[in-house]
Interface confidence: medium
């Protein structure tokens, strides 16, 4: 397949940054595209064979090299006026126009590294009203105050990641929409049966992987360096009054 | 060589049929359709080469115009999983692809028994913090942003409890303002009256209840998945 690394990349303005793209499909041709929010794909550069690359529609501020068939690194130079975007790499065989894409790299460039903040994460417990009204329980996870918006949120129950019953906002929300480098927030819901929530042995954890500064990035602020890190919040199930292990087991067996 | 895609946005109900279009003034030797989910790379769905060609892929039907200047994608009985950006691309003279801007498709789920409600949830660590959850509303209901910049309201998202074959819509609102209340958090959205359900005051010794539990967590996990 095609791999792009890293998935998220963060840089200070004025620095060159290189995005990697590797393919093991034995394809001669490789392509770099830029995609801005809500937009289609715009071709930056493409290469039909080793040592061979051509400018696309928006090559200014970018450079590429193609020493190997498998690799087509893209350098976003300091001359690029608006580098923050989603970058996609693709490859194809010379005989076909069918392109196969990598997973993409999200690049964010900021004026100042002091704008970088990791998220604060909180888990909110289900409302008793929801439990009595629907026999279901929704936990809400809130990640707030982070910049850039390079986060991945996941739910873990009793130590295992879960996907069923989960819904996460498709995009983080700007906390101050008018600001360029506004911090962001993101919410997610996990819904389980009331009986499952009401077992105090069940452990619920919301995990947010934040992609921030690397060890090499300079940091002069007096707060902790906002490096790439995992931030979590948790909750334990809560038994309802008059709820016994027998009635719980009954709930499990009938579910 | 430009490719025009229409419509730019399309929002339909689960189970409905739809057609999206891709047109150009130029002739293309071949044409591709891709589907892209947010934050992911596009995935190739099909390539059409011959004018007048029709290709079927389960519920998706692709057609290439006789003059090789246009193409259509028809989806039968759309599913929420069909949601995404549909991109068409034509073979350029340079061995590169010319991409259209895409059609953003949103397939709204059928909510079986909508039961709209707003609930207040408390932070598991500090009881003075809370969020408001608007849930179980039908897919026709739109959630509006707050006019107050200090109140945050998320877009609605769909949640699928696969083990219970149950889908629901929900949105979340919160604020640091002292006068923020769940009862009117979603007032800008057109929602039914009396949807706010305040939590009853709980008055029992949870410690006593917890003592009686000796449950197998693996069994619990099976119940969840």
């Amino acid at each position: 397949g095609i791999t792009q690394s890293p998935k998220y990349l963060f840089r200070k303005e004025g620095q060159n940054v290189t995005l990697s793209c590797e393919q093991n499909l034995n394809h001669d041709a490789m392509y770099w595209y830029r995609q801005d929010p809500g937009q289609g794909l715009r071709l930056i550069y493409y290469s039909q064979i080793v040592n061979d690359f051509q400018k696309g529609d928006i090559a200014e501020g970018y450079s590429v090299s193609r020493e190997k068939k498998e690799s087509f690194p893209l350098t976003v130079t300091s001359a690029q006026k608006n580098p923050t975007a989603f970058y996609l790499c693709a490859s194809s065989s010379r005989s076909s126009y069918e392109q196969y894409f990598g997973p993409g790299t999200r690049l964010t460039v900021t004026e100042d590294l002091k704008n970088v903040f990791p998220p604060k994460v909180a888990v909110f417990e289900p409302s008793e009203a929801e439990i009595s009204h629907t026999q279901k329980a929704t936990l809400v996870c809130l990640a707030t105050g982070f910049y850039p918006d390079h986060v991945e949120l996941s739910w873990w129950v009793n130590g295992k990641e879960v996907h069923s019953g989960v819904s996460t906002d498709p995009q983080p929300l700007k906390e101050q929409p008018a600001l360029n480098d506004s911090r962001y927030c993101l919410s997610s819901r996990l819904r389980v049966s009331a009986t499952f929530w009401q077992n105090p042995r069940n452990h619920f954890r919301c995990q947010v992987q934040f992609y921030g500064l690397s060890e090499n990035d300079e940091w002069t602020q007096d707060r902790a360096k906002p490096v790439t890190q995992i931030v979590s919040a948790e909750a334990w199930g809560r038994a309802d009054c008059g709820f016994t292990s027998e009635s719980y087991q009954q709930g499990v067996l009938s579910a | 060589q430009l490719l025009e895609q229409s419509p730019q946005f399309l929002s339909i109900q689960e189970g409905e049929n739809l057609t999206v279009y891709c047109n150009s003034s130029s002739v293309f030797s071949s044409l591709q359709w891709y589907r892209q989910e947010p934050g992911e790379g596009p995935v190739l769905l099909v390539t059409v080469v011959t004018g007048g060609e029709v290709k079927k892929l389960k519920r998706l039907t692709f057609q290439f115009g006789d003059a090789r200047k246009d193409s259509s994608l028809h989806i039968t009985a759309a599913q929420p999983g069909d949601t995404g950006l549909y991109l068409c691309a034509g073979a350029g003279s340079q061995g590169n692809l010319i991409f259209g801007k895409g059609t953003k498709l949103s397939v709204k789920p059928n909510i079986q028994n909508p039961d709209p409600a707003v609930y207040q949830l408390r932070d598991s660590k500090s009881s003075d913090k809370s969020v408001c959850l608007f849930t179980d509303f039908d897919s026709q209901t739109n959630v509006s942003q707050s006019k107050d910049s200090d109140v945050y309201i998320t877009d609605k998202t769909v949640l699928d409890m696969r083990s219970m074959d149950f889908k629901s819509n929900s949105a979340v609102a919160w604020s640091n303002k002292s006068d923020f209340a769940c009862a009117n958090a979603f007032n800008n959205s057109i929602i039914p009256e009396d949807t706010f359900f305040p939590s009853p005051e709980s008055s029992c010794d949870v410690k006593l209840v917890e003592k009686s539990f000796e449950t197998d967590t693996n069994l619990n996990f099976q119940n969840l998945s």
Partner: antibody, heavy 116, light 107 residues
Framework: EVQLQESGPGLVKPSQSLSLTCSVT?????????WNWIRQFLGNKLEWMGY???????NYNPSLKDRISITRDTSKNQFFLNLNSVTTDDTATYYC?????????WGTGTTVTVSS | DIQMTQSPAFLSVSPGERVSFSCRAS??????IHWYQQRTNGSPRLLIK???ESISGIPSRFSGSGSGTDFTLSINSVESEDFADYYC?????????FGAGTKLELK
């Protein structure tokens, strides 16, 4: 800076094999790029003959496919041209070059005359 | 194979003049054409890649244009060191092929 230098006999008899060496300095031939042989006939016409890639695979001009072989010795950072059953039509200046689509780096060339 | 036809075979100009070299491909090659200069007893030197893209170290008086089948290399003010042979080269399809060249001579 990468440099390429061709070497080999300047005179070859018809029906014999032509063997040339290209010595590369300033870049490892296994690190990347395609390593080509291109020849220029007496009337100045240029002909691409073939290449060996950094990973050792080949691509040849179909007009020479039955007679040509391009190999390499990675320990010496050299690649080689072998052309069988030569005729007087193979008299030319032979260049080794680094390239893929376009060819930015050429050797100085070596002239080979095919004559009895 | 794709044929590359260069015309004329000879061009005579004086220093300071503008000159254009023509190259025609036997089929549509988009912009997959490159231009080389070869001085007497020298190796070819890459001047322009992909019809119009400049090469670092090459004087800015050299420029290229065209797409599809018809291409032009221009020197906007010829200098004495520019009297040489000029070749076009397509990399659209294998085998990659060269034009027969145009000789730029001093008038």
């Amino acid at each position: 800076e990468v440099q390429l230098q061709e070497s080999g006999p300047g005179l070859v008899k018809p029906s014999q094999s032509l063997s040339l060496t290209c010595s590369v300095t300033g870049y490892s031939i296994t690190s990347g790029y395609y390593w080509n042989w291109i020849r220029q006939f007496l009337g100045n016409k240029l002909e691409w003959m073939g290449y060996i890639t950094y990973d050792g695979s080949n691509n040849y001009n179909p007009s020479l496919k039955d007679r040509i072989s391009i190999t390499r010795d990675t320990s010496k950072n050299q690649f080689f041209l072998n052309l069988n059953s030569v005729t007087t039509d193979d008299t030319a200046t032979y260049y080794c070059a680094r390239g893929g689509g376009y060819v930015p780096v050429w050797g100085t060339g070596t002239t080979v005359t095919v004559s009895s | 194979d794709i044929q590359m036809t260069q015309s004329p075979a000879f061009l005579s100009v004086s220093p300071g003049e503008r000159v254009s070299f023509s190259c025609r491909a036997s089929q549509n090659i988009g912009t997959s054409i490159h231009w080389y200069q070869q001085r007497t007893n020298g190796s070819p030197r890459l001047l322009i890649k992909y019809a119009s893209e400049s090469i670092s170290g090459i004087p800015s008086r050299f420029s290229g244009s065209g797409s599809g089948t018809d291409f032009t290399l221009s020197i906007n003010s010829v200098e004495s060191e520019d009297f040489a042979d000029y070749y076009c080269h397509q990399s659209h399809n294998w085998p990659t092929t060269f034009g027969a060249g145009t000789k730029l001579e001093l008038k």
